[in-house]
């Protein structure tokens, strides 16, 4: 399986909400011993390998934000914890999954990573991620709404699997 990022850059005004999206592509093993986790975390630019470093999103770890199920099932976080931080992650039956961030501030700017982890027999993990940048702007140069910039076809299919 692969992860595609439809948009590589989101430029948003302060105070706006944004939904960052990723899509799980390709065949997904629906065996009874396979569990899929989809989650999000922050990372930083300038690494040897994108998304290798991980940091929390608004103080929430990837475990606080994850969805887990078998295959292409729909799910969403109903965590009070996430919603108290203005966050909600969700996924649908078509492999799309997202994180919505409410009331953006300049501190939310940075690199975001979506991650899909396949676990077999509750043992080791096979993981694939996608990366996108969020720029939160303020002042007269800020857009009135979020502007999204599509990934190049190469980028959106550029898969980093560990």
């Amino acid at each position: 399986f692969k992860v595609a990022t439809p948009y590589s850059l989101y430029v948003c005004p302060e105070g706006q909400n944004v939904t960052l999206t990723c899509r799980l592509l390709g065949p997904v093993d629906k065996g009874h011993d396979v569990t899929f986790y989809k989650t999000w975390y922050r990372s930083s630019r300038g690494e040897v390998q994108t998304c290798s470093e991980r940091r929390p999103i608004r103080n929430l770890t990837f475990q606080d934000l994850h969805l887990h199920h078998g295959g292409h099932q729909a799910a969403n976080t109903s965590h009070d914890l996430a919603q108290r931080h203005g966050l909600e992650s969700a996924s649908d039956h078509h492999g799309n999954f997202s994180i919505t961030m409410r009331n953006l501030t300049l501190l939310d700017s940075g690199l975001y990573c979506c991650l899909v982890v396949e676990i077999r027999h509750h043992h080791s993990e096979h993981r694939v991620h996608g990366a996108m940048e969020l720029q939160v702007q303020t002042g007269k140069d800020a857009p009135s709404n979020c502007v999204v910039y599509p990934s190049s076809s190469q980028d959106s299919e550029n898969i980093t699997a560990a």
């Epitope: 986790y37 989650t39 991980r54 929390p56 043992h123 993990e125 096979h126």
Partner: antibody, heavy 121, light 112 residues
Framework: QVQLVQSGAEVKKPGASVKVSCKAS????????INWVRQAPGQGLEWMGR????????YYNEKFKDRVTMTRDTSTSTVYMELSSLRSEDTAVYYC??????????????WGQGTTVTVSS | EIVMTQSPATLSVSPGERATLSCKSS????????????LAWYQQKPGQAPRLLIY???TRESGIPARFSGSGSGTEFTLTISSLQSEDFAVYYC????????FGGGTKVEIK
């Protein structure tokens, strides 16, 4: 840089408990598992368990599950490993080590310097 | 549990020579989904903590000299040190991370 610094050597009597600390720096403490691995004198490495500092959830090797407790203090980025009902066979160097897994298992990329625990009457 | 067996227990080699260390697992550590071997190698010098050398059976950790190489797949793995330097005399451990964590008993590489 990423670093794990452990507490100093301990000498304990059989039946007592020992609590070893491991202070992390240089990375997001809450987002990476910390493992404990021990090494008896002249012996190999033995995995004891691990803790995810973000949640405090701990997972133990069956061999140690009745005697070991792993905790964390996010305010000081420190993980603790307490081993109770000590016996002479627990004399070993205890290491903390970070792993890079999300939900499964991974290799250990950073290690503490080790803490020597001696159990002797 | 997956049992890791290393051989030989001690290897006597002269500086500049090649050292070949073996590690065998009681079951395959190859993960079908990504065709990766969940095996790492560590070096440990006296009084020091282990140091990661190799992961995924053959990928060198950043900063590790090119004279260290890993190979093998499934259940049989090899760590090769192409030309031993004085600082390479140490104990080497293999480690599987496919199913929980287990280590081999170690191979001590000593000066001949």
């Amino acid at each position: 840089q990423v670093q794990l610094v452990q507490s100093g050597a301990e000498v304990k009597k059989p039946g007592a408990s020992v609590k070893v600390s491991c202070k992390a720096s240089g990375y997001s403490f809450t987002d990476y598992y910390i493992n404990w691995v021990r090494q008896a004198p002249g012996q190999g490495l033995e995995w004891m368990g691990r803790i995810f500092p973000g949640s405090g959830n701990a997972y133990y090797n069956e061999k140690f599950k009745d005697r070991v407790t792993m905790t964390r203090d996010t305010s000081t980025s420190t993980v603790y490993m307490e081993l109770s009902s000590l016996r002479s066979e627990d004399t070993a160097v205890y290491y903390c080590a970070r792993d890079d897994s999300f939900y499964g298992y991974w290799y250990f990329d950073v290690w503490g310097q080790g803490t020597t625990v001696t159990v002797s009457s | 549990e997956i049992v890791m067996t290393q051989s030989p227990a001690t290897l006597s080699v002269s500086p500049g020579e090649r050292a070949t260390l073996s590690c065998k697992s009681s079951q395959s550590v190859l993960y079908s989904s990504n065709q990766k071997n969940y095996l790492a190698w560590y070096q440990q010098k006296p009084g020091q903590a282990p140091r990661l050398l190799i992961y995924w059976a053959s990928t060198r950790e950043s900063g590790i000299p090119a004279r260290f190489s890993g190979s093998g797949s499934g259940t049989e793995f090899t760590l090769t040190i192409s030309s031993l330097q004085s600082e390479d005399f140490a104990v080497y451990y293999c480690h599987q991370y496919l199913s929980s964590y287990t280590f081999g008993g170690g191979t001590k590489v000593e000066i001949k």
